[in-house]
Interface confidence: low
């Protein structure tokens, strides 16, 4: 499988572009929109019929260091009576995001972009029934 | 990746902070290249809070294509297949990091950008807004 390349050949390179060594790219990690505060519908993770918990993963050699992962609390979904209905399934919803990975090689350090899969929350689905022949 | 020499006092100079600007390899290391959520699962159709997926394309961004979820209903689908308006379908949103070409149109110069995407929908008990 080919690893995707970020650079696009169809872009016309303006004169103002900074010089970059071959095979690499310049990345400013001062994040645009860094200070935007976000809150979804209040307590969505506990009000959902497919509730979930959050776990924070931390890695000092990753930027950002903190990545929050969701985990579905149940296999089934919560019905109107507050009981788990195992005829339905709680399933994770996932989204890819980019991180910068710092790698140490002796007294040198290198930086690598990495795609990570984040579980964002859960949704309740009708199960696919696999009939055994 | 591209290696950058560290300070002369290398063993004692473990920098806990990332520098503001880094040189990174053009290749992205990843294990998941399937960026079309329609191909990865059919949850968007099978969910009790189903959603449609809209393609958002921006050539100045990497990835240039991002799929945005929009809940199909205000309510949720009940066991009879009807919409139950005592419950709410709400989008699950996530901040993700993408690359923005900076300066614009430059092939190999980027800045990280935080964007908000709706990934899917979930069914929740509603918050009732009482009108005074």
């Amino acid at each position: 499988r080919k690893i995707p390349k970020v650079g696009h050949t169809f872009f016309q390179k303006p004169e103002s572009c900074p010089p970059v060594p071959g095979g690499s790219m310049k990345l400013d990690i001062g994040i645009i929109n860094e200070n935007q505060r976000v809150s979804m519908s209040r307590n969505i993770e506990s009000r959902s019929t497919s509730p979930w918990n959050y776990t924070v993963t931390w890695d000092p050699n990753r930027y950002p260091s903190e990545v929050v992962q969701a985990q579905c609390r149940n296999l089934g979904c919560i019905n109107a009576q507050g009981k788990e209905d195992i005829s339905m399934n709680s399933v994770p919803i996932q989204q890819e995001t980019l991180v910068v990975r710092r790698k140490h090689q002796g007294c040198s350090v290198s930086f690598q972009l990495e795609k990570v899969l984040v579980t964002v929350g859960c949704t309740c689905v009708t199960p696919v029934i696999h009939h055994v022949q | 990746g591209i290696t950058i020499p560290r300070n002369p006092g290398c063993p004692n100079s473990e920098d806990k902070n990332f520098p503001r600007t880094v040189m990174v390899n053009l290749n992205i290391h990843n294990r998941n290249t399937n960026t079309n959520p329609k191909r990865s699962s059919d949850y968007y159709n099978r969910s009790t809070s189903p959603w449609n997926l809209h393609r958002n394309e921006d050539p100045e961004r990497y990835p240039s294509v991002i799929w945005e979820a929009k809940c199909r209903h205000l309510g949720c689908i009940n066991a009879d297949g009807n919409v139950d308006y005592h419950m709410n379908s709400v989008p699950i949103q996530q901040e993700i990091l993408v690359l923005r070409r900076e300066p614009p149109h430059c092939p190999n110069s980027f800045r990280l950008e935080k964007i908000l995407v709706s990934v899917g929908c979930t069914c929740v008990t509603p918050i009732v807004h009482h009108v005074a």
């Epitope: 519908s41 | 199909r72 908000l116 918050i127």
Partner: nanobody, 124 residues
């Protein structure tokens, strides 16, 4: 915060027409869904029509072909054109919207909001 204000209700004869409008105001970032529900005396609130951000619409079977929902995104307004009205269409019509908005520096991605309702009476 967000406010939904309906207008256009009133008394109309069977077979007549009315146009309801609902304007959303406040620190709105995006409107995922806007639409109309109605509640007749002694009955549960029911869907009339919804219009989604992409422009697609969803109607209750009882109003299909008679009612048309439309939206003006620039004004954050939704309209309900009601033709061939029947006595059974008599109800309080509520505007509803699923809205992402700012409040106190925080972005709320999705909250269901309701208007106070406008009365539509179909009677001869």
């Amino acid at each position: 915060e967000v406010q939904l204000v309906e207008s256009g209700g009133g008394l109309v004869q069977p077979g007549g027409s009315l146009r309801l409008s609902c304007a959303a105001s406040g620190t709105i970032v995006n409107i995922h869904v806007m639409g109309w529900y109605r509640q007749a005396p002694g009955k549960q609130r029911e869907l009339v029509a919804l219009i989604f951000s992409g422009g697609s619409a969803d109607y209750a079977d009882s109003v299909k072909g008679r009612f048309t929902i439309s939206r003006d995104n620039s004004k954050n307004t939704v309209y309900l054109q009601m033709n061939s009205l029947r006595p059974e269409d008599t109800a309080v019509y509520y505007c509803a919207a699923e809205i992402g908005y700012y409040s106190g520096g925080t972005y709320y991605s999705s909250e269901a909001h309701w208007g106070q309702g406008t009365l539509v009476t179909v009677s001869s």
